[in-house]
């Protein structure tokens, strides 16, 4: 009779993490009598995965009933596969012996490869806000994928970025891998509504890449421009001065009026108008009683935006001449003004 051969028909098997791997093995004969064992690896360091004769192997089930007398199918299923299960599995026939069974024939081995999906990319921006024309760095991280091959791209508002550096760790072999990428982005005044996207493509994602996003609204600070104008006279002895605070982001803003260097009033931006680009405008009025002043008055609008050092704009109010109408510089976008006229 022809000598028993152990057949492992699959040279390789590819399984997604969490799924069940089927490792096929058949024998060509019932003789010699003896058990089958499955090992991961060969040589003296091989690991026992399943022993037909004895032992407890909770993750392993046999495909067919090994207790049946004529059974020659020794295929097994390994449940809940993780990347750590990758390796070559050998189906080994043992011959009954005394006191111990002896190894008789080994299959050619089946290489088990495990695919694991990358985690959703997490994009994080700088800790502190930056102003337009500055370059800021964004990082993107994704973990737990296998195999190592992966593609990462960066986009800003749909346009692919080229200034980035990517590392996949570890450099050697691992049960799973991580990717870390840093992209440099130059901010513009129009970036309040902009998005930075990190896109990760991996064989496990079947052409449907994972994306992580960061809103530049969390990163950008657009400093305001100030304009102080004198409005037409409201009463014989009163002058209305406005401070237009334009194109700022974020909204956090505090305005202080100074008369000849003395604090007159402080207020916080509340009823702001939003521009199409996501920046804000705000207007504050100050009603000045001219008759209370003997000399010319220097009015200063001082703005502290988002915790930054204050910026200011001044306007000289001539008291000696009779107050007349001086060009009102209001723009259409400034209609949402603050009408709390406090003196």
């Amino acid at each position: 009779e022809e000598e028993l051969q152990v057949i492992q028909p699959d040279k390789s098997v590819l399984v997604a993490a969490g799924e069940t791997a089927t490792l096929r093995c058949t024998a060509t004969s019932l003789i010699p009598v003896g058990p089958i064992q499955w090992f991961r690896g060969a040589g003296p360091g091989r690991e026992l995965i399943y022993n037909q004769k004895e032992g407890h192997f909770p993750r392993v089930t046999t495909v067919s009933d090994l207790t049946k007398r004529n059974n020659m199918d020794f295929s097994i299923r390994i449940g809940n596969i993780t990347p750590a299960d990758a390796g070559t599995y050998y189906c080994v026939k043992f011959r009954k012996g005394s006191p111990d069974d002896v190894e008789f024939k080994s299959g050619a081995g089946t290489e088990l490869s495990v695919r694991a999906k990358p985690s959703a990319p997490v994009v994080s921006g700088p800790a502190a806000r930056a102003t337009p024309q500055h370059t800021v760095s964004f990082t993107c991280e994704s973990h737990g994928f296998s195999p190592r091959d992966i593609t990462l791209k960066w986009f800003k508002n749909g346009n692919e970025l080229s200034d980035f550096q990517t590392n996949v760790d570890p450099v050697g072999e691992s049960v799973s891998y991580s990717i870390h990428s840093t992209a440099k982005v130059v901010l513009t005044r129009e970036d309040v509504h902009s998005q930075v996207i990190c896109e990760v493509a991996h064989v496990t994602l079947q052409g449907d890449p994972l994306r992580g996003t960061a809103n530049l609204s969390e990163t950008i600070r657009v400093p305001p421009t100030l304009e102080v104008t004198q409005q037409p006279v409201r009463a014989e002895n009163q002058v209305n001065v406005t401070c237009q605070v334009r194109k700022f982001y974020p909204q956090r803003l505090q305005l202080t009026w100074l008369e000849n260097g003395n604090v007159s009033r402080t207020e916080t931006a509340s009823t702001v108008t939003e521009n199409k680009d996501g920046t804000y405008n705000w207007m504050s009025w100050l009603l000045v009683n001219v008759s209370a002043h003997r000399d010319d008055v220097k009015l200063t609008c001082q703005v502290e935006h988002d915790g930054q050092p204050a910026v200011s704009k001044s306007h000289d109010l001539k008291v000696s001449a009779h107050p007349k109408e001086q060009g009102s510089n209001t723009a259409a976008e400034n209609t949402g003004s603050n009408e709390r006229n406090i003196y």
């Epitope: 690896g41 040589g43 003296p44 360091g45 390796g87 190894e103 050697g172």
Partner: antibody, heavy 122, light 112 residues
């Protein structure tokens, strides 16, 4: 093409510890044994020990109490540490890859490093 | 430990002529699966050893077919059908059945 490169000090003082690293490039660490073999000047080859991809180690009993082999798959490296060295440990140290695919035995040490000379002297 | 004994210690050869090296093990290297776990290596002067034969008779990749291995159990032989000048060096047998792996003392092949 798999290549192995040994690195470490060429001179070690008696009673100190010899530390060598072997960097594996161009191939996988999986499914192989990673071995250290030495050759004293003008003498034959002596197997020191090896480590499998699962971290299991096997040592030559004549050196076991002094030798530790470790594997860092993430760096594609494996290392040899030997304590309490004497002049008798002066040798060329080779790192090598050992194949295994046919049961309990081994199927050839098929890739060798170029060897690094270690002298034990004060 | 398995003791490996090689002979001869030195082998002067003539290019183009055959050569033969013997290796004996203190216990059988034939495992129950039918494989004989014996390797042959050649260490050329100033170089690292190179695998020639594994499992007693299987030629390693890239090894010229003038090298052949035979034997089983405890007696093994490496034959070179026609020696070439590049074959000079020390030939070692090594048992790969069990740890510690052990080498023979080596056979130095040199041109006459």
């Amino acid at each position: 093409q798999v290549q192995l490169q040994e690195s470490g000090p060429g001179l070690v003082r008696p009673s100190e510890t010899l530390s060598l690293t072997c960097t594996v490039s161009g191939g996988s660490i999986r499914n192989y044994y990673w071995s250290w073999i030495r050759q004293p000047p003008g003498k034959g080859l002596e197997w020191m020990g090896f480590i499998y991809d699962n971290g299991r180690t096997f040592y030559n009993p004549s050196l076991k109490s002094r030798v530790t082999i470790s594997l860092d798959m993430s760096m594609n490296q494996f290392s040899l540490k030997m304590t309490s060295v004497t002049a008798a440990d002066t040798a060329v140290y080779y790192c090598a890859r050992v194949r295994a695919y046919s049961g309990i035995g081994l199927d050839g040490t098929d890739v060798w490093g170029q060897g690094t000379t270690v002298t034990v002297s004060s | 430990d398995i003791v490996m004994t090689q002979s001869p210690l030195s082998l002067p050869v003539t290019p183009g002529e055959p050569a033969s090296i013997s290796c004996k093990s203190s216990q059988s290297l034939l495992y129950s699966n039918g494989y004989a776990y014996l390797d042959w290596y050649l260490q050329r002067p100033g170089q690292s050893p190179q695998l020639l034969i594994y499992q007693g008779s299987n030629r390693a990749s890239g090894v010229p077919d003038r090298f052949s291995g035979s034997g089983s159990g405890t007696d093994f032989t490496l034959k070179i059908s026609r020696v070439e000048a590049e074959d000079v060096g020390v030939f070692y047998c090594m048992q790969a059945l069990q740890t510690p792996l052990t080498f023979g003392g080596g056979t130095k092949v040199e041109i006459k």
